[in-house]
Amino acid sequence: VAKKKDKVKKGGPGSECAEWAWGPCTPSSKDCGVGFREGTCGAQTQRIRCRVPCNWKKEFGADCKYKFENWGACDGGTGTKVRQGTLKKARYNAQCQETIRVTKPCTPKTKAKAKAKKGKGKD
């Protein structure tokens, strides 16, 4: 839904109006699409074109958004590291997992460090 820009708009030089008050974006037909936002200032009125999005998916971008912890230490055995994400926001109809685990390969540097640590532990 279009964000309400109800902040006042200052009138131009020589204008009687000090501030314009803008109403919400009202679609011309149905509940979304192109419409108009009406502004008033004293006896004056203005209409500007605006748009209310029709597609929830476009509005939200990704269906599921997560807040992630920092990456864990490199596991020398698997050569991967893990981090957990907790659901932050889901598109209304998206059936998102509450928590997810993401793995990625360790960088060569991290792998070497993890192997070295493992080696030391064996001695």
């Epitope: 509940d31 907790t86 932050k88 889901a90 209304y92 109809n93 997992q97």
Partner: antibody, heavy 117, light 107 residues
Amino acid sequence: QVQLVQSGGGLVQPGGSLRLSCAASGQSFSSYWMNWVRQAPGQGLEWIGMIHPSDSETILNQKFKDKATLTVDISKNTAYLQMNSLRAEDTAVYYCSSWSAKRGDFWGQGTLVTVSS
Amino acid sequence: EIVLTQSPATLSLSPGERATLSCRASESISNNLHWYQQKPGQAPRLLIKYASQSISGIPARFSGSGPGTDFTLTISSVEPEDFAVYYCQQSNSWPLTFGGGTKLEIK
């Protein structure tokens, strides 16, 4: 499990305002859409709008654009419905409900708002 | 706005009978249709989500079908505690809308 406890209903004069509260406990309040629905006496259910606590994104039924304002206070795990310019036809039980497409929803117990002089 | 039409308005059955409640959408809403049960003085309770998905804690006698424009809630064998009002709701587009309800009453 999410528990929603509602408060703030009561008798209001026509033209008056009222702020309803919906306090959440249990699982993460900030991850799920909070809906507000009302039900006039002996009538069906009517959706007012919804808000997402994580960023306060609000989707409002256009019918209520000049009547209702939805807000949240994440520090208090509470959602609010502010109703203005109340009229006799706004007399209803107002419900909040927390929605997850994966697990379903949880509803508050409802709070009765009576608009009368 | 998507209009949901429920039928019948009232359904009179005896315990043990099969209940079939209908909800028709004014346009295709995919599977974005949910069923609620409401008893007097109580908040609605979600029975089925997304046309046919079951909800934890809801008895297996409740089932739903869809998608598209015609949806059905079936109670395979009505129990005494099932007598209530049933609402369908769509979440395909806003405003979210509810059907007018079907009252399931004891015959």
